[in-house]
Amino acid sequence: RTTTCFGDGCQNTASRCKNGGTWDGLKCQCPNLYYGELCEEVVSSIDIGPPETISAQMELTVTVTSVKFTEELKNHSSQEFQEFKQTFTEQMNIVYSGIPEYVGVNITKLRLGSVVVEHDVLLRTKYTPEYKTVLDNATEVVKEKITKVTTQQIMINDICSDMMCFNTTGTQVQNITVTQYDPEEDCRKMAKEYGDYFVVEYRDQKPYCISPCEPGFSVSKNCNLGKCQMSLSGPQCLCVTTETHWYSGETCNQGTQKSLVYGHHHHHH
């Protein structure tokens, strides 16, 4: 948020940028939370996303029996490791085909025991408020598919007739991590010292991080003819003075007619 300044007063403005604003030669460049000529005003809404996609990571272990472990497989930059990675990835892409959330696999470690493959299965889905359910379902299908393939693709008489064969009992799901998206937490963090006064409200399933100074929401503060301004003690109404009236009160709803004051009378409406 930027406000441009022209003329002789600009040099003075430069040293007066507030709230961490920086002078760029023309104007105060304000940090995210502030705006105004001197970055003196607090914004009334903060963009908190949501992210376009949400990811999940499943830590799995499978035992490949159709490949004998060799020392070279410990070295991730060896040709042997690269070839194993390629074949394993191709095999897993076949196993998990049909899972729209499936992104790929990432081998973290290969160790002895035929070849024990510690790896992550990566999942991703478009953000919707139901993303947790979508990813929970996908992780269940991953478990089903890997269990099925490691039961079916097995060595017979020490020979494998598939791209890879597995040890049925060597399949384990260690851990499942879903990227947490917490709009309330994000809102509080991004509002910094004003966090107590910003809340999340939903519109068309999209979260909005707003202060009561943002109009059009259930928490919005009605300042009538005044202006809502955020301070460290919360939202306050700054009341205006017109040619004919002074306005006062917490929501600037009390108007005092100037002519009556000058005539030493008070009239409220």
Partner: nanobody
Framework: DVQLQASGGGSVQSGGSLRLSCAAS????????MAWFRQAPGREREGVAF???????SYAESVKGRFTISRDNALSTLWLQMNSLKPEDTGMYYC?????????????????WGQGTQVTVSS
């Protein structure tokens, strides 16, 4: 870069013999697995035999006792000695290799391939 060159194919009468060879360049000959596959017209490529770096061998049931796979690590060469050939052995024969110690006869597990050499067995 690994390159495989198969040769030795030809036409032979039923009961005859052929010796196929496969020269490997850029392949660490003392490691991994080398194999022979074949493909008859209109059929899938099938594993014939493979040999590991330690000399362990395995054969398809249909060729056991008739075919012998061997490799010379010093010469980086793979061979397939085929005896008592039958008309059903007819097809294009390919050599394949993997840097891994494999125990599979599935073609998808082998990343390196030579061009084929044709074997025709007539009755």
């Amino acid at each position: 870069d690994v390159q495989l060159q198969a040769s030795g194919g030809g036409s032979v009468q039923s009961g005859g013999s052929l010796r196929l060879s496969c020269a490997a360049s850029g392949f660490p000959s003392s490691r991994g697995t080398m194999a022979w596959f074949r493909q008859a017209p209109g059929r899938e490529r099938e594993g014939v035999a493979f040999i590991n770096s330690d000399g362990r061998t395995s054969y398809a049931e249909s060729v056991k006792g008739r075919f012998t796979i061997s490799r010379d690590n010093a010469l980086s060469t793979l061979w397939l000695q085929m005896n008592s050939l039958k008309p059903e052995d007819t097809g294009m024969y390919y050599c394949a290799a993997s840097l891994l110690y494999l125990m599979t006869v599935n073609a998808a597990a082998y990343p390196y391939w030579g061009q084929g050499t044709q074997v025709t067995v007539s009755s």
